[in-house]
Structures are given as C-alpha cells and as structure tokens.
Interface confidence: medium
C-alpha cells in the first residue's frame, strides 16, 4: 500500500484526532496529504511544532503554502515563530516575529484568540 492509499484508508478517522495522537504519528513514517490535514481539529493542530508538521506531512508539506490563509493552517502559522517557519523554505508569513517572547497565557488567548506577545 502506498502512502496515498494509506491515508485514504485512515482519513475518515482523523477528523477527531487529539494532539497526542498527531504527535505520535509525526514520529512514524507517514506522509499525510493536505486534504486530510485540513480536516483536523484546529485545537489539535495548534500545539504541533514546525518540525512535527513537517514530519507528519512529509513531501506534502509544500502544500501548506497554498493553504496558508485557511484553517487550520492559518491559525497554526500564527502560533509559530517566523524563523521556524522560514526553515521550511515555503515563504510562509504571519508567524511570531523573531525576538518576541511568547507568553502562553490561556486567559489571554481565550480573550483575544491569539498568543500574548512581548516585544524585544
């Protein structure tokens, strides 16, 4: 079974995937297609690092550029450091500016929907 067939087989299960399971899959030899990735719960995708998303998508990571204005990719980009996004070489913009400190305050996020940033 090739990677595409593999994810067609399992994508119906993935919509409700918790972050922990996505992290586990990122540690294994998978290449999730973008259509499947876009169906994931936003709250499950947000905690994933750039490296984890890169490993989860494998060669399909290039497709993030085309989806950068759509959820969950848009919201995920907003949570990443720009210098981490730059390592993908895809020209993704909108990450946390280099030098800013992220305060992971749940109340702040609940009010504003975005992380609280402190300037350099």
């Amino acid at each position: 079974m090739n990677g595409s067939e593999y994810f067609v087989k399992i994508q119906s299960f993935l919509g409700g995937a918790p972050t922990e399971d996505l992290k586990a899959l990122s540690q294994q030899n998978v290449s999730m297609d973008l259509a499947t990735f876009m169906k994931l719960r936003t709250d499950a995708v947000l905690p994933l690092t750039v490296a984890e998303v890169q490993k989860l998508l494998g060669p399909h990571v290039e497709g993030l550029k085309a989806e950068e204005r759509h959820r969950p990719v848009r919201d995920w980009i907003l949570r990443q450091r720009q210098d981490d996004l730059d390592t993908l070489g895809l020209g993704l913009q909108g990450g946390i500016p280099n030098g800013y400190l992220v305060l992971d305050l749940s109340m702040q996020e609940a009010l504003s929907g975005t992380p609280c940033l402190l300037g350099p």
Epitope: M1, Y6, G16, D21, Q27, Q28, T49
Partner: antibody
C-alpha cells in the same frame, strides 16, 4: 547514514549506579523521540524509557520495573541521549540499545552486567 | 499493559516455503485508524532491524518477500519465499500505549 555510538556498560554490583550514553548522527536528532530498550535471555526485548521533544518539555516515560531508579535525558546540542541507572538489580542485566522514533534505527547495544 | 502474544515460538521451513508468524494484541493497537504494530528481524549479535511498520508498510530496503497484514488486534508477518538468509528471531512491537511492548519472538530456522 544513521549511526549510534553507545557507551557506559560494564560490570556493576547490585545497588550500584551506571550511566549509559548514546551519541547519534545522520538525522535531525532534536526532532525525534528517543528510547532505551534492553534485551536479556530471560525477558527478551523490553522497552525501558522514552524521552520526547523540547516542544513537549522533554516529557519522559518509563517501564514500571525501572520507575524511580532510572532517568532518561537528552542533550540535543550533542545529539545525545543518556540513561542514568541507580539502585541496580540483577534483573537489570542485559544489552541496552538506544533507538529512534518507533524503532526505525537502533544502536549496536552496550552490555550491562549486575552481579556481586 | 498491552500484551503481544506471538506464535509459533519457532518454526523450521525449507527454502522456498512460506513462513507465517502471528502477533495477537490484548487490545486494539490503532491510533485513529493507524495500526501501530511493527515487525523486526534480529540476527545473532545484531540489534533488531525494522522490516514492517504500521502493520503493512515495508521499510525501505527490505525485500518484497516480507509482508505484513492485519488490523486492530490480529497481525501477521509473512515471508514468501523463505531464504537461507532469513534465519533470525522475529519480533512484533506495539507503540500504541506506554509502556511499549514486544512480542516474545519467533525463531525461524531453515531445514
């Protein structure tokens, strides 16, 4: 090419301590969970400990048989993972392997013998 | 803990025959539809080598004589045809739940 260099095994008395090291190369070490797995004739292959990523605050997990005695750590700047073993018992004797992710690559193993 | 029961404990086959090794899990090893069972080959004096990941995916560089099948709790490693070089112990591993657990191993001998 993925490579591991394990060290630190040897003979130790019951109740003693030992620290194993594993230096990895050939992949982006900081992106992967690392594990220690041991093997003995009595117990076969036995997963021992796991350490996750910086983004997971280096979360650790242990087999029940080693909880409170063993401690796994990593130094991403050195592409290294360690296993500090205290209060060693005879049943800890075996070959200790470091492995990456879900076992895609393994080191050659280092032998620990706990005996008086 | 998830218990993996392998059978048979050993088997001896002539070259060209088919080897079938079973691994039964005490509960489902599926992560959102992905069966996280993996098969390893271990030859004397060597570390285990990954053959099959996610129940049925052939690791790069592993001969197509090796295949994996099954889902949820029942899995099979098949070697067809068996060759002299396949003499080894074969193990299954589940990475669904901590603690990760291995099967007891199946020793393959060639007649």
């Amino acid at each position: 090419e993925v490579k591991f260099e394990e060290s630190g095994g040897g003979l130790v008395q019951p109740g003693g301590s030992m620290k194993l090291s594993c230096v990895a190369s050939g992949f982006t070490f900081s992106n992967y969970w690392m594990n220690w797995v041991r093997q003995s004739p009595e117990k076969g292959l036995e997963w021992v400990a796991q350490i996750r990523l910086k983004s997971d605050n280096y979360a650790t997990h242990y087999a029940e048989s080693v909880k409170g005695r063993f401690s796994i750590s990593r130094d991403d700047s050195k592409s290294s993972v360690y296993l500090q073993m205290n209060n060693l018992r005879a049943e800890d004797t075996g070959i200790y392997y470091c492995s990456v992710g879900t076992g895609g690559y393994w080191g050659q193993g280092t032998t620990l013998t706990v005996s008086s | 803990d998830i218990v993996l029961t392998q059978s048979p404990a050993s088997l001896a086959l002539s070259p060209g025959k088919r080897a079938t090794i079973s691994c039964r899990a005490s509960e489902s090893v599926s992560i959102i539809g992905t069966d996280v069972i993996h098969w390893f080959q271990q030859k004397p004096g060597q570390p285990p080598k990954l053959l099959i990941y996610h129940a049925s995916n052939l690791e790069t560089g592993v001969p197509a004589r090796f295949s994996g099948s099954g889902s949820r709790t029942d899995f099979t490693l098949t070697i067809d045809p068996v060759e002299e070089d396949d003499v080894a112990i074969y193990y299954c591993l589940q990475s669904r739940k901590i603690p990760w657990t291995f099967g007891g191993g199946t020793k393959l001998e060639i007649k």
